[in-house]
């Protein structure tokens, strides 16, 4: 995470580390069941076989996990099946849901974020030397409307609709390379939601180009039905 | 439907060179790893080696490295087995395989296989 | 590379009755394997993976079982369409089939 700032430790109870076999961060992921991690596709081009992935959670540190950490294999990799960048992993053993193991909540099918609502981004990523390199950082993040994003002077009609937008316009805070397949959420009445993925940029904070996310309320049917038959 | 179905098999010398292609369809061709698998007769089931969707990576087993050159085609929606210097024991049922069920977990989708036959 | 010792090679067993085939890797797999059916003239069919976990449309009476490096895969009340080689095939690292076993009804 570029800017933003270092997060309370454990303040994202369902922020993943995807990591390879030899315990190398790449990019992140969301607990959404005790079985489950959504993250992106573009992270499981590295490797087709399960056994390349392992997933940690409940860390702040990126590299001097703490004892309470759980470090679990992935037994299976599903791929959302019309080329959007969003996959499933499926946990070889339940996560232990405790104080900082805890799915995130997905939202309803189809839910569309207002323009303007303030989400979160966390994630271990580049930082392009803003403060806070090894640690999980957070940075709020206003959605962006896609007909704003699509503007020629922003993305230009690169943003598709099962995709979001989020960002300050004046740049200097974004996702980065390394955050890719973690979250974005939102705070909705009394608890955050899973609204995005995060996905790709131009760069990384840079003026005008915000980072885009893929929207999780366009594939709720297509995560639950594969938790269901798998 | 997924369809994988392999080509170019046949009588070749030794020494000679062969490629053989497979062609896919019925699913995202371009996302996905492909690998061939070889079968000589009366014997058991051996991988040959993978490619990934962009052709960036390409693993091979060891043993048949230096003899064989795995590439792809997305455009074409095909894979193909370009085999060098063989040798009698490259007389095999040659299939191609993937990973058809939007899931990667084993090789789930097969063709039925190209045979070749190495003889002078 | 990891080498995949499956047996027995061959085995006969009667309508309606149980067989077990086994394989053993030359290190720990992780659990990361699967079980095909090949008959002539067809690719394989993938039955399980990740040791025991039956793929969408495959009977119960296939089952697998196992963990580090020995594995087992069984099939009950034998049915004459289960006359086929079966294979084991580690994807810990990279993929290896064990030898086959060559299944006949008596």
């Known amino acids: 995470v570029v800017g933003g700032c270092v997060a309370h430790p454990h303040s994202w109870p369902w922020q993943v580390s995807l990591r390879t076999r030899f315990g190398m961060h790449f990019c992140g992921g969301t607990l959404i069941s005790p079985e489950w991690v959504l993250t992106a596709a573009h992270c499981l081009e590295k490797s087709p076989r399960p056994s390349s992935y392992k997933v940690i959670l409940g860390a702040h540190q990126e590299v001097n996990l703490e004892p309470h950490v759980q470090e679990i294999e992935v037994s299976r990799l599903f791929l959302e099946p019309t080329r959007k960048d969003i996959a499933l992993l499926k946990l070889s053993s339940p996560a232990v849901i405790t104080d900082k193991v805890i799915p995130a909540c997905l939202p309803s099918p189809n839910y569309v974020v207002a323009d303007r609502t303030e989400c979160f981004i966390t994630g271990w990523g580049e930082t392009q030397g803003t403060f806070g390199a090894g640690l999980l950082k957070e940075a709020q993040l206003p959605v962006i409307e896609n007909k704003v994003c699509n503007r020629y002077e922003f993305l230009n009609g690169r943003v598709q609709s099962t995709e979001l937008c989020a960002g300050h316009l004046a740049g200097g805070t974004d996702s980065c390379q390394g955050d890719s397949g973690g979250p974005l959420v939102c705070f909705e009445k009394d608890k955050y939601i899973l609204q995005g993925v995060t996905s790709w940029g131009l760069g990384c904070a840079r003026p005008n180009k915000p980072g885009v996310y893929v929207r999780v309320s366009r594939f709720v049917t297509w995560i639950e039905g594969v938790m269901r038959n798998n | 439907e997924v369809k994988l179905l392999e080509s170019g098999g046949g009588l070749v010398q030794p020494g000679g060179s062969l490629k053989l292609s497979c062609a896919a369809s019925?699913?995202?061709?371009?996302?996905?790893?492909m690998s061939w698998v070889r079968q000589a007769p009366g014997k058991g089931l051996e991988w040959i080696g993978e490619i990934n969707p962009d052709s960036s990576t390409i693993n091979y087993t060891p043993s048949l490295k230096d003899k064989f050159i795995i590439s792809r085609d997305n455009a074409k929606n095909s894979l193909y087995l370009q085999m060098s210097k063989v040798r009698s024991e490259d007389t095999a049922l040659y299939y191609c395989?993937?990973?058809?069920?939007?899931?990667?977990?084993?090789?789930?989708?097969w063709g039925q296989g190209t045979s070749v036959t190495v003889s002078s | 590379d990891i080498q995949m010792t499956q047996s027995p090679s061959s085995l006969s067993a009667s309508l309606g009755g149980k067989v077990s085939i086994t394989c053993k890797a030359s290190q720990d797999i992780n659990k990361y394997i699967s079980w095909y059916q090949h008959k002539p003239g067809k690719g394989p069919r993938l039955l399980i993976h990740y040791t025991s976990t039956l793929q969408p449309g495959i009977p119960s009476r296939f089952s697998g079982s196992g963990s580090g490096r020995d594995y087992s895969f069984s099939i009950s009340n034998l049915e004459p369409e289960d006359i086929a080689t079966y294979y084991c095939?580690?994807?810990?690292?990279?993929?290896?089939f064990g030898g086959g076993t060559k299944l006949e009804i008596k």
């Open positions: 395989a993937s990973y058809c069920g939007y899931s990667y977990d084993a090789l789930d989708c």
């Open positions: 019925g699913f995202d061709f371009s996302r996905y790893w």
């Open positions: 095939l580690q994807y810990d690292n990279l993929y290896t």
